[in-house]
Interface confidence: low
Amino acid sequence: ELLDPCGYISPESPVVQLHSNFTAVCVLKEKCMDYFHVNANYIVWKTNHFTIPKEQYTIINRTASSVTFTDIASLNIQLTCNILTFGQLEQNVYGITIISGLPPEKPKNLSCIVNEGKKMRCEWDGGRETHLETNFTLKSEWATHKFADCKAKRDTPTSCTVDYSTVYFVNIEVWVEAENALGKVTSDHINFDPVYKVKPNPPHNLSVINSEELSSILKLTWTNPSIKSVIILKYNIQYRTKDASTWSQIPPEDTASTRSSFTVQDLKPFTEYVFRIRCMKEDGKGYWSDWSEEASGITYEDRPSKAPSFWYKIDPSHTQGYRTVQLVWKTLPPFEANGKILDYEVTLTRWKSHLQNYTVNATKLTVNLTNDRYLATLTVRNLVGKSDAAVLTIPACDFQATHPVMDLKAFPKDNMLWVEWTTPRESVKKYILEWCVLSDKAPCITDWQQEDGTVHRTYLRGNLAESKCYLITVTPVYADGPGSPESIKAYLKQAPPSKGPTVRTKKVGKNEAVLEWDQLPVDVQNGFIRNYTIFYRTIIGNETAVNVDSSHTEYTLSSLTSDTLYMVRMAAYTDEGGKDGPEFTFTTPKFAQGEIE
């Protein structure tokens, strides 16, 4: 009897559409009204413990009151019907939960896939969030047979894997039904032969074989997936060098039908390549397999494709009739060496005279030569053969170099140091660029590189440091020997100087002082010194700043006050900022020389 409620709310378990209107009715029982001496006028409606304004109530009769909600926006509303009893005490009569949501939208983009060896899986776009438990059912049938429904699981509501085995070459019709408390909708039907939805297993046992005859090819072999007995396959074959991150692809038209081997051409000699392969139905209907496991192979060696960069240096302290010449060359990069380098062959021919041969393992050769003109050649050898020869004329001792490059410039760009010049009118065979770090503490140790005779702009290919002064020399090389070298200084990146200039007085008068300073050592400059600023002040006065050109090493301060202590310091500036030197003090005399009180 105690558990018998005082009334009830209708409807009992409402599910309503978001942003719709909804009316609930609370009906009081006669015995309750008699016991508490109340009627429907005493009903108070509450949502989530907040009282609803009376304007939303309608008294239907003495036992029933209704409340209406317009444009419901909450997903979950606790609604209670209460009565005000003796002394305005509130008693709960009944409570319900109003659940809001949306009817399902028509599922779209239904598509299916048959992973080889597995059952068909379909997926779709379920549409907007309904905020309600919505069940998706995948339905499928042949013209003559209905298959069991596939009910999507709650954690993957937009896909389902069927229970039956796939039959190829028979069309199947598939659609999706979506249903919740607010409605039921069906997707468009799709009709297809499952053979057009196959995703094959990847080819396996991929292996790579090289060829001794051709250094530019590698042969791939693989085992096809079992599905090859059902469909004709086509392939994507991708490859990259071992250290690369991006893949190249064989033209698809070359691999457009079932096969189990392929020869990849136009590869670089003596290079390790990584391959992978995938397949799908040859007409492009269906899905690509995953990529196979990768396999690698190395192409066979070929003779070096280029002669090394070749240059020479002459020891300036030569003895009478002879000079010491150091021939130098650069190691070929792997893509030009095309194999393991065995040795270098140098020939030296005195002008119209005998020839000397040298076989060298290093990248330099020092020889004593007479003061005559010589022709030097250099070839590099690997297992397969020799490169073409690099040829260098070492002119006679009395040779006068002319025809330098013009308008030589050097500048940093994109973290590299670029050099450009105007080419001489004469035919240049090649250019030699040499560079070194200028320092007061260490000799200028030179690095070098060679550029073709057609080049007039390049960057220095070395490990360059920031805030170091590089002396760069460009020498054009002609058929009869080197031209005149041209040099320029440059920085990869400037910084403010590490130290400022130390200023001192050269001469101090009653109303002026001649200041002097030394140029900053190159090791502390960290850039091109563009200008100096002299700052000077008295103990009580404002500081005055004077800008001075960077070519100067002295400056006269004028209009000074006699018998006064001055403080002076100096800053040097590069393109990246300045640095102050130490402060220096001096006092102007009370009288000029020869002047008496």
Partner: nanobody, 123 residues
Framework: QVQLQESGGGSVQAGGSLRLSCTAP????????MDWYRQAPGKEREFVSS???????GYADSVKGRFTISKDKAKDTVYLQMNSLKPEDTGMYSC?????????????????WGQGTQVTVSS
């Protein structure tokens, strides 16, 4: 096979931040999506966040508002910026190429997992 490489994990106090990276050399994040998952000791692996081909993002309720997923197409890298970390965020974080919809599967080497990077948040 795509080699996914996570990094950026470590130990941090509650309230701190970490930025995880997932790099896939040779894998184009512009043609596939990426998911982040995590697994705390003795618990099941759970979804954390995802980013799709077009840059659409999604988050588990437990990390919404604290974690941000983004990608750098040029570097083939997906990032997970984790702010206001809590002890319950502790776990092994792994990235996985995103299956996406069937329509994009043929563009994706999908379903590959990385080795994971450990995140430890102490109170």
């Amino acid at each position: 096979q795509v080699q996914l490489q996570e990094s950026g994990g470590g130990s941090v106090q509650a309230g701190g931040s970490l930025r995880l990276s997932c790099t896939a050399p040779g894998f184009t994040s512009n043609s596939c999506g990426m998911d982040w998952y995590r697994q705390a000791p003795g618990k099941e692996r759970e979804f954390v966040s995802s980013i799709s081909t077009d840059g659409t993002t999604g988050y588990a309720d437990s990390v919404k508002g604290r974690f941000t997923i983004s990608k750098d197409k040029a570097k083939d890298t997906v990032y997970l910026q984790m702010n206001s970390l809590k002890p319950e965020d502790t776990g092994m974080y792994s990235c996985k190429t995103k299956d996406g919809t069937i329509a994009t599967m043929e563009l994706c080497d999908f379903g590959y997992w990385g080795q994971g990077t450990q995140v430890t948040v102490s109170s």
